[in-house]
C-alpha cells in the first residue's frame, strides 16, 4: 500500500507512518515504528500537557508567587495548568494573571458600579443627579439623596454628587 499523506484525528505522520498522539497528561517517549505503537509516559509531579500531543517534555505548572500577591485558585493536574488568582483586595493585571495590583477605590462623587474580583478591577461610575458619594471606597455605591419630604422636612441645602441634601424644619409662619 501507498504510504499515507494524512492521518486520522489523534494521529500524526512521521516516517510515512501514522502514529498515535499521546493523550493529555502524557508526553512522547518514542514515535511508533513498523513494529511498535507510540510510547508515552505520564507527566511528572508539577507538570502537565493539556492536548493530544507529541511533545517530548511536559510543561511546568504555573507558580502562583505570593510575593506578587498571587495565590492558587485551582491546583494543576497532569492535564491542566494551575490557575492563579489574587489575594483579597487585589486583582490580576492581565488575563494570564502573572501579577496583582490593589483594587481601585472610587473617589467622592463616584460610586462602585461593579465590585472588583480576583481578575477584574473596580468599575466606578459618576453619581447621577439625586445620588452622592462622600467617601473614597472600593465597595460603596452612590447613595440616593435623603428625601426631606418623607420626613416632613424641607431642603435647606441642595445635595451634590459628593454631599447629601441638608433637611430642615418647615417654616411654620404664614402671612
Amino acid at each position: 500500500p501507498e504510504p499515507p499523506t494524512a492521518c486520522r484525528e489523534k494521529q500524526y505522520l512521521i516516517n510515512s507512518q501514522c502514529c498515535s498522539l499521546c493523550q493529555p497528561g502524557q508526553k512522547l517517549v518514542s514515535d511508533c515504528t513498523e513494529f511498535t505503537e507510540t510510547e508515552c509516559l505520564p507527566c511528572g509531579e508539577s507538570e502537565f500537557l493539556d492536548t493530544w500531543n507529541r511533545e517530548t517534555h511536559c510543561h511546568q505548572h504555573k507558580y502562583c508567587d505570593p510575593n506578587l500577591g498571587l495565590r492558587v485558585q485551582q491546583k494543576g493536574t497532569s492535564e491542566t495548568d494551575t490557575i492563579c488568582t489574587c489575594e483579597e483586595g487585589w486583582h490580576c493585571t492581565s488575563e494570564a494573571c502573572e501579577s496583582c495590583v490593589l483594587h481601585r477605590s472610587c473617589s467622592p462623587g463616584f460610586g462602585v458600579k461593579q465590585i472588583a474580583t480576583g481578575v477584574s478591577d473596580t468599575i466606578c461610575e459618576p453619581c447621577p443627579v439625586g445620588f452622592f458619594s462622600n467617601v473614597s471606597s472600593a465597595f460603596e455605591k452612590c447613595h440616593p439623596w435623603t428625601s426631606c419630604e418623607t420626613k416632613d422636612l424641607v431642603v435647606q441645602q441642595a445635595g451634590t454628587n459628593k454631599t447629601d441634601v441638608v433637611c430642615g424644619p418647615q417654616d411654620r409662619l404664614r402671612a
Partner: antibody, heavy 115, light 112 residues
Framework: QVQLVQSGAEVKKPGASVKLSCKAS????????IYWVKQAPGQCLEWIGG????????NFNEKFKSRATLTVDTSISTAYMELSRLRSEDTAVYYC????????WGQGTTLTVSS | DVVMTQSPLSLPVTLGQPASISCRSS???????????LHWYQQRPGQSPNHLIY???NRFSGVPDRFSGSGSGTDFTLKISRVEAEDVGVYFC?????????FGCGTKVEIK
C-alpha cells in the same frame, strides 16, 4: 545511510561477563530504540530487550532481565549490552537492530562461552 | 509468552514456482490500536536477518513484489509468487504485539 556496526567476536569462560557494543551512524541516535536479539546455533531467535537512547528507558524479556544490562553512550552514538554470569548456553550470535523508517541490523557479534 | 509456530520446517521448491509458508501464533496478534504486529524476514546463509514484510502485509522498501503477506488474528501466510535462486534461505515470522517479542523457528527454503 543508516549503519549499525558491532564489536568483534568474544571468547569467554563460564561465570565471566562480556560487554558487546553497537555503534550507530547515519541517523539521529536518540530518535530510535536499539534492540538486541540472540541467535544460538540450532535454536529459535530470542528477543533480549531494547533501550531508548533518549532517556535510557529499557524493556526486557524477563528471561534475560537478571543478567543483561543495556546502556547507551549518546556522545558516541553507541549502545551496549553487558551479559553477566555467562554459561555455555549463552554461546550465540548477538545482533543489535533498529526499526522506524526501515529496519536495520548490525552484522552480529559471535560470543563463545567455553571452559 | 506468545508461541510462534511455522510450517513447514523445510520447503524444497522449483525455480519459478510459488511457495507458501504458514505462521500461527498462540494468541491473537491484534493490538488494541487496531494494528497487527506480525512480520516476516529472510536470512541468507552467513548474513544478518533482512526484513521483508511488516504488519502482516506491508512490504519494506526494495522488497520485490513477488513477496506478499496475508492473514489476521493468529493465522498468517507468506507467499512467494515465483521463487528465484536468490530467495534461498531461512524465513522467520515474528510478533511485536506482546512483550516479550517472539519469533518462529524458521522455514528453510531450498531449490529442488
Amino acid at each position: 545511510q543508516v549503519q549499525l556496526v558491532q564489536s568483534g567476536a568474544e571468547v569467554k569462560k563460564p561465570g565471566a561477563s562480556v560487554k558487546l557494543s553497537c555503534k550507530a551512524s547515519g541517523y539521529t541516535f536518540i530518535s530510535y530504540y536499539i534492540y538486541w536479539v540472540k541467535q544460538a546455533p540450532g535454536q529459535c531467535l530470542e528477543w533480549i530487550g531494547g533501550i531508548n537512547p533518549r532517556n535510557g528507558g529499557t524493556n526486557f524479556n524477563e528471561k534475560f532481565k537478571s543478567r543483561a544490562t543495556l546502556t547507551v553512550d549518546t556522545s558516541i552514538s553507541t549502545a551496549y549490552m553487558e551479559l553477566s554470569r555467562l554459561r555455555s548456553e549463552d554461546t550465540a550470535v548477538y545482533y543489535c537492530t533498529r526499526h522506524g523508517n526501515g529496519v536495520y541490523w548490525g552484522q552480529g557479534t559471535t560470543l563463545t562461552v567455553s571452559s | 509468552d506468545v508461541v510462534m509456530t511455522q510450517s513447514p520446517l523445510s520447503l524444497p521448491v522449483t525455480l519459478g514456482q510459488p511457495a507458501s509458508i504458514s505462521c500461527r501464533s498462540s494468541q491473537s496478534l491484534l493490538h488494541s490500536n487496531g494494528n497487527t504486529y506480525l512480520h516476516w524476514y529472510q536470512q541468507r546463509p552467513g548474513q544478518s536477518p533482512n526484513h521483508l514484510i511488516y504488519q502482516v502485509s506491508n512490504r519494506f522498501s526494495g522488497v520485490p513484489d513477488r513477496f506478499s503477506g496475508s492473514g489476521s488474528g493468529t493465522d498468517f501466510t507468506l507467499k512467494i509468487s515465483r521463487v528465484e535462486a536468490e530467495d534461498v534461505g531461512v524465513y522467520f515470522c515474528s510478533q511485536t504485539t506482546h512483550v516479550p517479542w517472539t519469533f518462529g523457528c524458521g522455514t528453510k527454503v531450498e531449490i529442488k
